[in-house]
């Protein structure tokens, strides 16, 4: 199931790249699958927020991107996530790339990586 999530993530990143006009030489942070959840591409200076993933949810390939971006570009997400909410993790897009997740997944979500046995 997590392989499927990863594949869905890569598809969503590709669609987001097209929408945002991103390519390999674009400044900013590429979308990524971090083995827990999916992070969409972002411009330098943007903070991206994601909800804690539901471990065993089946992803719908046509779902809207389940993140919220704060910064100069708005991806048009319907969610209104906020770091004052429970179960929200953020990363900043910096000139050096993505920051570490804040808070750490383990503290915000109760787990920090998928177990290999599941």
């Amino acid at each position: 199931i997590f392989k499927k999530e990863q594949a869905m993530c890569l598809e969503k990143i590709q669609r987001a790249n097209e929408l945002m006009g991103f390519n390999d030489s674009s400044p900013g942070c590429p979308g990524m699958w971090d083995n827990i959840t999916c992070w969409k591409p972002a411009h330098v200076g943007e903070m991206v927020l994601v909800s804690c993933p539901e471990l065993f949810r089946i992803f719908n390939p046509d779902q809207v991107w389940e993140t919220e971006t704060i910064g100069e570009s708005d991806f048009g997400d319907s969610n209104s996530l906020d770091l004052s909410d429970m179960g929200v993790v953020s990363r900043n897009c910096t000139e050096d790339g993505w920051s570490e997740p804040f808070p750490h997944y383990f503290d915000a979500c109760g787990f920090d990586e998928y177990e290999s046995e599941t």
């Epitope: 770091l83 004052s84 909410d85 429970m86 929200v88 808070p103 750490h104 503290d107 915000a108 109760g110 787990f111 920090d112 990586e113 177990e115 290999s116 046995e117």
Partner: antibody
């Protein structure tokens, strides 16, 4: 009924290693839904979380920065217990040390505690 | 580190009183906050987790509220066994810091 029973010396000399053990009954140190923590309490520092170990297919540890260079928390699956080692102790490490189980429901909290062990660091 | 402050540091009350203890975090912690009760010579005991959830076996006269940086623990109709010290703890950023405690004694 989860119970945590602590053991270890109450007196440690400066520069030596403080070693305590926490025996778990009614649960397992390998429980994938729990964490196993050490906390200490002193008049000068109050309650201070020191670190935790947990199993999620592999063993992991998180430590407080204030003791990270000196602390080791190890699980012992054969005895369902876990231990604390704190190296190079000074009189400032004098405190009551507690072990506790961490559980997640919306956030991590400590729902069962050991009885506490007063450790005095003195020559 | 996130600093946790509590007020008051101590209070005197009578059986049957309603008391409120406040806890403030030095930065936003959403609702990642726990409350513990400690009696002399004993380990802390969990009362409330995630700001307002009552731990199993804890009487309903205890309640918690708050989000962000400001939190409260309320004890309705104080009972003799409630005279103790109460600590808050933030549970989102390592190290998971505790407040300095509020001692509740008999007036």
């Amino acid at each position: 009924q989860v119970q945590l029973q602590q053991s270890g010396p109450g007196l440690v000399k400066p520069s030596q290693t403080l070693s305590l053990t926490c025996a778990i009954s009614g649960d397992s140190v390998s429980n994938r839904l729990a964490t196993w923590n050490w906390i200490r309490q002193s008049p000068s520092r109050g309650l201070e979380w020191l670190g935790r170990t947990y199993y999620r297919g592999k063993w992991k540890n998180h430590y407080a920065v204030s003791v990270k260079s000196r602390i080791t928390i190890n699980p012992d699956t054969s005895k369902s217990q876990f231990s604390l080692q704190l190296n190079s102790v000074t009189p400032e490490d004098t405190a009551v040390y507690y072990c506790a189980r961490g559980v997640w429901i919306g956030n991590w909290f400590l729902d069962h505690w050991g009885q506490g062990t007063l450790v005095t660091v003195s020559s | 580190d996130i600093q946790m402050t509590q007020s008051p540091s101590s209070l005197s009350a009578s059986v049957g009183d309603r008391i409120t203890i406040t806890c403030r975090a030095s930065q936003m912690i959403a609702r990642y906050l726990n409350w513990y009760q400690q009696k002399p010579g004993k380990a802390p005991k969990l009362l409330i987790y995630a700001s307002y959830n009552l731990q199993s076996g804890i009487p309903s006269r205890f309640s918690g509220s708050g989000s962000g940086t400001d939190f409260t623990l309320t004890i309705n109709s104080l009972q003799p066994e409630d005279f103790a010290t109460y600590f808050c703890q933030q549970a989102i950023i390592n190290p998971y810091t505790f407040g300095p405690g509020t001692k509740v004694d008999i007036k």
